[in-house]
């Protein structure tokens, strides 16, 4: 076994090329210079190495860079990235968006792996915030990325980055996440006119408070039922029948099909039945005529 550590005569690799696919593991270990490998990393992508051979190449890089690979090497890792562990990646300092894109491209089509999650975490922490270009890149590869962040992490998203968000990027966000994103979106889109503003803000409305919904109801926005059903129940409850009618416009007829589902169900329970009847939709379950409605929350506040 001892003599295997020396590179056989004439086998020393002068460049990283396909002749190396004929090398046994021990020959790769002995005959490939790690510094040469580091400078020609891009070539590894183009050579059909076996898994075992890739393990050897990774091991050589690990020995050369025990503190973590430099970005010049990371950018050209190609599918060797799939062999990296989260522990390896935590040692990296990735600052270039091009490097991030190159590695995400390698993982394209896969679920977000622990390696990718670690890479993104390192990158975003290095930048200090989730800027527009980064968010653009991440949501292009992982449409659900934004909704995988905690409300605390989302708080570091600057309002300017919201322009990069597409409706499908918010599909899996829960109300707590939308609570954080909505004020940022409102700020980002504040200078747009009514109809354009509504198109942009619509996906974020799951985080909107009652007063904003009331304001929207005065702008002939014709909100669709799918958006209405994603609104916060506590924000919908104080809306009057007239406000909901204005908010939904021609889509108001869709309330009938949703009358057993939140937030429509809970909203109906808070409305006077004679107000609901004015919609002509046959909505049932409102407060019967003649009943006095006490707002207990207001009473408590007064006492």
């Amino acid at each position: 076994e001892v003599e295997k550590t020396a590179c056989p005569s004439g086998k020393k690799a002068r460049e990283i090329d396909e002749s190396l696919i004929f090398y046994k593991k021990w020959e790769l270990e002995a005959c490939v210079d790690a510094a040469l490998l580091a400078t020609q990393m891009d070539r590894v992508n183009a050579i059909p190495f076996t898994y075992e051979q890739l393990d050897v190449l990774k091991h050589k890089l690990d020995e050369l860079y025990p503190q973590g690979y430099p970005e010049s090497v990371i950018q050209h890792l190609g599918y060797l990235f799939l062999k990296m562990s989260p522990e390896d990646i935590r040692k990296w300092n990735v600052t270039s968006l091009e490097t991030l894109k190159a590695l995400l491209e390698v993982n394209k089509g896969h679920e977000m792996s622990p390696q990718v999650a670690t890479l993104i975490d390192r990158f975003v922490k290095g930048r200090g915030q989730l800027d527009k270009d980064t968010l653009d890149t991440l949501t292009a590869f992982y449409p659900g990325y934004l909704c995988s962040l905690s409300p605390e992490e989302l708080s570091s998203v600057p309002p300017s980055s919201i322009w990069a968000v597409r409706p499908q990027d918010l599909d899996t966000c829960d109300p707590r996440q939308l609570d954080v994103l909505y004020p940022k979106a409102r700020l980002a889109f504040q200078n747009m006119n009514g109809s354009e503003y509504f198109v942009k803000i619509q996906s974020f409305l799951g985080g909107a408070p009652t007063e904003d919904l009331k304001a929207l109801s005065q702008q002939n926005v014709s909100m669709d039922l799918a958006t209405f059903m994603k609104l916060r129940t506590d924000a919908v409850l104080p809306l009057t029948v007239a406000e909901v009618q204005k908010l939904l416009g021609p889509h108001v007829e869709g309330l009938k099909a949703e009358e057993r589902h939140r937030p429509v169900r809970d909203w109906i329970l808070r409305q006077r039945q004679d107000d609901l009847d004015t919609l002509g939709l046959g909505l049932q379950g409102g407060i019967p005529n003649g009943y006095l409605v006490l707002d207990l929350s207001m009473q408590e506040a007064l006492s």
């Epitope: 696919i21 891009d42 183009a46 059909p48």
Partner: antibody, heavy 123, light 115 residues
């Protein structure tokens, strides 16, 4: 002379598993200078590499991203053959499926191919 | 954008030369890739024609005539298959292939018609 003979069902129902086998003559599935591939071809997707298996002191597999999670390639040294299983098929998986040898002396080019099996996914 | 792009068809007269291109996606440098070329006739599997990396590093498939040759055009970031002295039996589909990021990738193929 190396030859590959394919066998397997040509009609599979949606959501079921597609299974094909490739019998090798003139070479061994555990050869350390070859890899054994599955490729498919359809009008919509053209030629598409699905994955490969190879033996280098133990068995390894590489799979295409497009089918990862649905595909398994196994080898059987006693019968000198390898097989493809593709789970949860849809009509999109309708294609002619080929097995092929990659020869390391051709830098793993696929130099020997099976005859092809038309697999139709339909209820 | 596809990794490898080939023109869908090409027509030429018998005896003429045909140059088939295989363009690599921007950002993937043709210089470091070995290009593999396959011929496929109707009803048959593809057959290896040749592999080409450079003039000093190329392989002709077993029994493949020297009329088939490979080259690269670095400025176009493309691999090229040249068929000289075109014959009627050369009418077929031609595919390029590379190993890229852990898997084999094929071009969409070029259908060659001999007029």
């Amino acid at each position: 002379q190396v030859q590959l003979e394919q066998s397997g069902l040509g009609l599979v129902k949606p959501s079921q598993t597609l299974s094909l086998t490739c019998a090798i003559s003139g070479d061994t599935v555990s050869s350390d200078s070859a890899a054994w591939n599955w490729i498919r071809q359809s009008p919509s997707r053209g030629l598409e590499w699905l994955g490969r298996t190879y033996y280098r002191s133990k068995w390894f597999n590489d799979y295409a991203v497009s089918v990862k999670g649905r595909i398994t390639i196994n080898s059987d040294t006693s019968k000198n053959q390898f097989s493809l299983q593709l789970n949860s098929v849809t009509p999109e998986d309708t294609a002619v499926y080929y097995c092929a040898r990659s020869n390391s002396y051709y830098y793993y080019a696929m130099d020997v191919w099976g005859q092809g099996t038309l697999v139709t996914v339909s209820s | 954008q596809a990794v490898l792009t080939q023109p869908s068809s090409l027509s030429a007269s018998p005896g003429a030369s045909a140059s088939l291109t295989c363009t690599l996606r921007s950002g993937i440098n043709v210089g470091i890739y070995r290009i593999y070329w396959y011929q496929q006739r109707p009803g048959s599997p593809p057959q290896i024609l040749l592999t080409y990396k450079s003039d000093s590093d190329k392989y002709q498939g077993s029994g493949v005539p020297s009329r088939f040759s490979g080259s690269k055009d670095a400025s176009a970031n493309a691999g090229i298959l040249l068929i000289s002295g075109l014959q009627s039996e050369d009418e077929a589909d031609y595919y390029c292939m590379i190993w890229h990021s852990g898997g084999w990738v094929f071009g969409g193929g070029t259908k060659v018609t001999v007029l």
